[in-house]
């Protein structure tokens, strides 16, 4: 079953290569288990950046080596992607799945265009 997912159109990563955005979903029921996947679309290729499964009220559960972190509040997921470089600029799509209880719902956002600008190296000072 389909579900609406909203996310910002554009986000600029900070100088440390960290970008944050909110992924909000319109839950048709009271889900206790939610899975969130961040996908990156660039040059018509789609790759999975990270994925998390969490319980309502719990912190997101990303793999330990993930570049993503996040927290949840109601039907909003606050996502942070770290370690970004200019080459990582692209469209980052939020996919939300309501895993339990049935019925299963899935929604995909329109994507957040994340722009990453590598910082200029500091000039040597004598």
């Amino acid at each position: 079953k389909a579900m609406h997912v909203a996310q910002p159109a554009v986000v600029l990563a900070n100088s440390r290569g960290t970008a944050s955005f909110v992924c909000e979903y319109a839950s048709p029921g009271k889900a206790t288990e939610v899975r969130v996947t961040v996908l990156r679309q660039a040059d018509s290729q789609v790759t999975e950046v990270c994925a998390a499964t969490y319980m309502m009220g719990n912190e997101l559960t990303f793999l330990d080596d993930s570049i993503c972190t996040g927290t949840s509040s109601g039907n909003q997921v606050n996502l942070t992607i770290q370690g970004l470089r200019a080459m990582d600029t692209g469209l980052y799509i939020c996919k939300v799945e309501l895993m339990y209880p049935p019925p299963y719902y899935m929604g995909i956002g329109n994507g957040t265009q994340i722009y990453v600008i590598d910082p200029e190296p500091c000039p040597d000072s004598d």
Epitope: E33, T53, Y54, M55, G57, N58, E59, T61, M99, Y100
Partner: nanobody
Framework: EVQLLESGGGLVQPGGSLRLSCAAS????????MAWYRQAPGKEREVVAG????????NYGDSVKGRFTISRDNSKNTLYLQMNSLRAEDTAVYYC??????WGQGTLVTVSS
Amino acid sequence: EVQLLESGGGLVQPGGSLRLSCAASGFTFSSYTMAWYRQAPGKEREVVAGISRSGGTTNYGDSVKGRFTISRDNSKNTLYLQMNSLRAEDTAVYYCRAVSDYWGQGTLVTVSS
């Protein structure tokens, strides 16, 4: 083979306490948010409590807040549920859950005088 084996259920009087355990094997326990669910006869399965991977974050269903405590020991691959001030309406089969992948077989808790 993935296994979640619950234990600790049984018959207890109202106001009494029980401690449920769930021994996990066959998967990386510390990588999972864990939870306890329960299902009373003729009712839908409901969430009782959940706990994050590290154990640093917990949440509870409204009906058990202040009475039940969920905890985990990642070194022992074990999930716990301490249940105090038990009531007749807590009677149910309690299931261990590795969110959102695996279920235990359940352990029956009966609260009756």
